[in-house]
Structures are given as C-alpha cells and as structure tokens.
C-alpha cells in the first residue's frame, strides 16, 4: 500500500474504561494531530477506518462491527462499545484515507475491572476543593455524548463504598455533588454511577474521582520566612562549617509556583566562587500548605565569607519577601596566660 503518515502509538492518551460499561472513544487524529475535523474530512471524501491489535499480539486485525446487538459500532469519528469486555484491551488504530491521502494513529485501550466498592487500577483525576469556602460542586465527569438530552438518567453518588443520601455537608444534586462546606473529613474517593436506558437495555457509567481539600484563597498570605530571623545569630570561626536554614511557609494557592532562593552579596550562589552547597526539602500540611527549607552550607568558612550578606528570598503568587541572616565572626576566646594575666597587672 502507498505511504501513510503514521503518528505511531499515542501513549499520552492511555484510555482506561470499565468492563461491562459503554465506552465512546473519539479518534485522536482530529483531536490532536490534524488541523481539520471529521466533518471536513468526510465532506472531502476521506474514509475513517478502524482496526486493532489484541493485547500481547502483534497482528493488526479489523474490528468486528457485526457482533450481536451491535456491541461495537462506529459513528462518525467515535468508536462505541455497548458494552466493553475485558478482552477488548489492546492497541486501537484509526486511519483516515482516500486514494491520495493517508494518516493514522494508534492508542492503547485498557478495559479495567472494578470491585463492588469501585476500587480498580483506574488512574483517578484529582479535584481540589477549598476548605471552609462555601458552596463548591463537582460534576460527574466524562458522561457527555452517551445519551440524548431527552433521556433523564438516574445518578447515584458514593463516597468510598457508601451511598451518599443524608443531608450532611455533602449533597448529591443530580450530575453535581455539592459540598456545602468542604472539610478535611471530605477527603476521599467519590463515585457517580449514571444509569440510563437505550434500546430496551440499561447501561451504567461509573466515574470515580479523588477529592482533596486544600487551603482556601480566603486564608492565603504572602510567603512567611520563619528562618533566618532576628533572634538567631550565626557566629562562626574561620574554618568552621556555616549552615544557615531558610525555612519558608507558603499558603496553598492553586497553580502557584513557590520559589525559595539564596543570594550572597546580591548574587545567586552559582554566580560566585565560594564553595557553597544548597539542599532543599519540602513538606506539606493536610491542606497542601507548603514549607520549603533550603540549607545553605559552606564547609570551611573564611573570614571573608563571614563578612558577606546572606539573604533568603521567597516568592509565590501572593508576593515576594526576603530576609537577611545575621552572620558574624566569633571573637576568639582570650588565652588565659597572656590576656588575663596582663589584665591583672602581672609582669
């Protein structure tokens, strides 16, 4: 056959679907690789062809669209499973072609089993809610296109294994799950099960996501430098090791980049000739507030080093702060025989 633009195996789109549930999978060509959509391609006389390679096989084979009850079908640029079976797992290819043009891409599809509490190897999306922020909602994801708007599905929400049905601070409202006030105790996995009829059959869609309750923007503050501070003086003799921690607290801020850095005499450590090392550690609170510690270390400090200015800087979306460490050279202890004796007038 003539040359085909092969986009290879698109592992970025590792599609996971639950066993025995409907799945609709759009050909990724139109989503991510080509500059035109399916309608344009179809109007131009291009045909979309599907085939697949079973798990642990090398042989590409056509998809059987003649299964009982049209279990697998194609509609425009969508491949439908009504429903999936475990052995549908494999690499699927969609190819767009006519006599003069050809483009194709493959993607992995994994059919996943779940237990009665919705536990499975499925990678779960994480939804962050602000703590004690007021009303926030999550919406049952990825159910568009499965049934027409005229069909009214029933939706059941679960936290972990348990159906949510009491009027506590988390309230199911159809496709939405409303958190009247999000608390740390609301952290966990939430599942919506959407049940809808189609051609005399009943289908279920199961969608699980992880809720993580994080710090509220109402409580967010600029970075707070706990160390260095005015109460600690780093007093060293030449030749000793100088260790100065810079410890900074950052409020959780969605999509904020938290930065901590040292300057020595106004320059980044990389830009000066001192033999300095910096080690960073990061810890998080339950609401994802962050504490970053950068320890500046000079193994054998010189008297010149002890005269330099050491400043810790921190920046987040809330602002930028800086604090200088108090560094000084230790005055050598007097040698008794000479200094003290002279002090007492001994000759």
């Amino acid at each position: 056959s003539e040359r085909c633009d092969d986009w290879g195996l698109d592992t970025m789109r590792q599609i996971q679907v639950f066993e025995d549930e409907p799945a609709r999978i759009k050909c990724p060509l139109f989503e991510h690789f080509l500059k035109f959509n399916y309608s344009t391609a179809h109007s131009a006389g291009l045909t979309l062809i599907w085939y697949w390679t079973r798990q642990d096989r090398d042989l590409e084979e056509p998809i059987n669209f003649r299964l009982p009850e049209n279990r697998i079908s194609k509609e425009k640029d969508v491949l439908w499973f009504r429903p999936t079976l475990l052995n549908d797992t494999g690499n699927y290819t969609c190819m767009l072609r006519n006599t003069t043009y050809c483009s194709k891409v493959a993607f992995p599809l994994e059919v996943v089993q779940k237990d009665s509490c919705f536990n499975s190897p499925m990678k779960l999306p994480v939804h962050k809610l602000y703590i004690e922020y007021g009303i926030q909602r999550i919406t049952c994801p990825n159910v568009d296109g499965y049934f027409p708007s005229s069909v009214k599905p029933t939706i059941t929400w679960y936290m972990g294994c348990y159906k949510i049905q009491n009027f506590n601070n988390v309230i199911p409202e159809g496709m939405n799950l409303s958190f009247l006030i999000a608390l740390i105790s609301n952290n966990g996995n939430y599942t919506c099960v959407v049940t809808y009829p189609e051609n005399g059959r009943t289908f279920h869609l199961t969608r699980t996501l992880t809720v993580k309750v994080v710090g509220s923007p109402k409580n967010a503050v600029p970075p707070v430098i706990h160390s260095p501070n005015d109460h600690v003086v780093y007093e060293k003799e030449p030749g000793e090791e100088l260790l100065i921690p810079c410890t900074v607290y950052f409020s959780f801020l969605m999509d904020s980049r938290n930065e901590v850095w040292w300057t020595i005499d106004g320059k980044k450590p990389d830009d000066i000739t001192i033999d300095v090392t910096i080690n960073e550690s990061i810890s998080h609170s339950r609401t994802e507030d962050e504490t970053r510690t950068q320890i500046l270390s000079i193994k054998k400090v010189t008297s010149e080093d002890l005269k330099r200015s050491y400043v810790c800087h921190a920046r987040s979306a809330k602002g930028e702060v800086a604090k200088a460490a108090k560094v000084k050279q230790k005055v050598p202890a007097p040698r008794y025989t000479v200094e003290l004796a002279c002090g007492f007038g001994a000759t």
Epitope: G134, I135, K152, K163, Q165, I171, E173, S178, L180
Partner: antibody, heavy 118, light 111 residues
Framework: QVQLVQSGAEVKKPGASVKVSCKAS????????MHWVRQAPGQGLEWMGI????????SYAQKFQGRVTMTRDTSTSTVYMELSSLRSEDTAVYYC???????????WGQGTLVTVSS | QSVLTQPPSVSAAPGQKVTISCSGS????????VSWYQQLPGTAPKLLIY???KRPSGIPDRFSGSKSGTSATLGITGLQTEDEADYYC????????????FGGGTKLTVL
C-alpha cells in the same frame, strides 16, 4: 410534564395532627428532593424541611423538630408531611416543592390550606 | 423576622426597570448561591433565578440576578403589569445542620 398534586384542605382542632400528601408525576421520583414550605395568611415563605425520596432521609428546620415527620412511598411516588400538636399559628398553606438544596426549588404543588381552630 | 432582609415593597411604571435587594450574612448569602421566586396573587411560588444569576428555561431575560458579598439583587427590566407579584430571595445555611432560608418578600407594584 412535572406535576405535584397535594391533598385537599383540612380543618383541625388545636393539639391534633394533620397529614398532607403530595403525589409526584412526570419525572423520576427518586432523582429529586422534596421540600415542604408553608405560608401563613398574608405572610412570607417558611421552610419546614426536606426529604430524600431515594433513601427516605430527612432534615427538618429546628423550629419544627419533634413536631414534623416527612415520609415517602416510592411505589406511589408520594411524599407525606405530618405536623402534630397543632396550634392556631400553624394555620397556613402548606406547599410540597421539588428541587435540590443549592440550585433552587423548581416545581411547587398547588398548596394545601390547613386551618387550626377550636 | 427573616434572616434575609428584603424591602417590603417597591414600585415602578410599566417599561421601567426595578431592582429588589436581599441582604444576608457570610453564613448564608456570602458563601452560598441565591435563588429568587415570583408569587403571583393566589398561586404557588415560581422559580425565577437560581445559582445567583441563572434562569430556568421559560423565564424571560428581562429577569436577572446578581450577587456581591453578602447581598443579592433581582433586576426586572421592561416592567409589565403581569409582573405585579411578591418576590422572595432564598439561600441556605449549614452549620452542622441544613437550613433553607427565605427573605421576608417584596411586594412589587406596577403603577
């Protein structure tokens, strides 16, 4: 189309109980909550409580706690509101109303007038 | 005494614009969504606005809602005689227990 049909007007003596019914049709009964709201003559709206027809769980306004009971019968798509120890200030139109908690109450019954008089 | 405060009455001429305010606190309006209802004389209330500013299907765009801080506002433009009714704001509060709250109602008179 969504319909909430309530039982007829009631006249009760102080100290008695009243049970108002609300039959739902035109939608999946267990997919929406049912509120009960009352309106005394010439007054505003007062929320009494809510029932989840799916599991039967309830939440009552503090003011009515201990005096009100909301129940449902899924086989007939009907909810009930019983108010006990009636007093004259309970004279009002009682509405059942379908809706969620955070996005409004979208369909209301026609109302049931309960008169408490000795 | 309602938890949400509305003016008892407002009036305007046909074709005019009118606003009805609803004042609450951080524990109700401040943190939550507001709905608005219209109650024509002798009828059950009807939902006009939910989620602060969304209209159910069938509600004309002459009706609008907004929220700022602990107050909400219902706006009606191109006033018509059939708009003469009582209007109620509604939200909820949750402090370990759910409580749906209504404003005291505002009587709109079309002059």
């Amino acid at each position: 189309q969504v319909q909430l049909v309530q039982s007829g007007a009631e006249v009760k003596k102080p100290g008695a109980s009243v049970k108002v019914s609300c039959k739902a049709s035109g939608y999946t009964f267990t997919s929406y909550y049912m509120h009960w709201v009352r309106q005394a003559p010439g007054q505003g709206l007062e929320w009494m409580g809510i029932i989840n027809p799916s599991g039967g769980s309830t939440s009552y306004a503090q003011k009515f706690q201990g005096r009100v009971t909301m129940t449902r019968d899924t086989s007939t798509s009907t909810v009930y509101m019983e108010l006990s120890s009636l007093r004259s200030e309970d004279t009002a139109v009682y509405y059942c109303a379908r809706g969620f908690v955070t996005s409004g109450i979208d369909y209301w019954g026609q109302g049931t007038l309960v008169t408490v008089s000795s | 005494q309602s938890v949400l405060t509305q003016p008892p009455s407002v009036s305007a001429a046909p074709g005019q614009k009118v606003t009805i305010s609803c004042s609450g606190s951080s524990s109700n309006i401040g943190n939550n969504y507001v709905s608005w209802y219209q109650q024509l004389p002798g009828t059950a209330p009807k939902l006009l606005i939910y989620d602060n500013n969304k209209r159910p299907s069938g509600i004309p765009d002459r009706f609008s809602g907004s929220k700022s801080g602990t107050s909400a506002t219902l706006g009606i433009t191109g006033l018509q005689t059939e708009d003469e009714a009582d209007y109620y704001c509604q939200t909820w509060t949750y402090t370990g227990r759910l409580w749906i709250v209504f404003g005291g109602g505002t009587k709109l008179t079309v002059l």
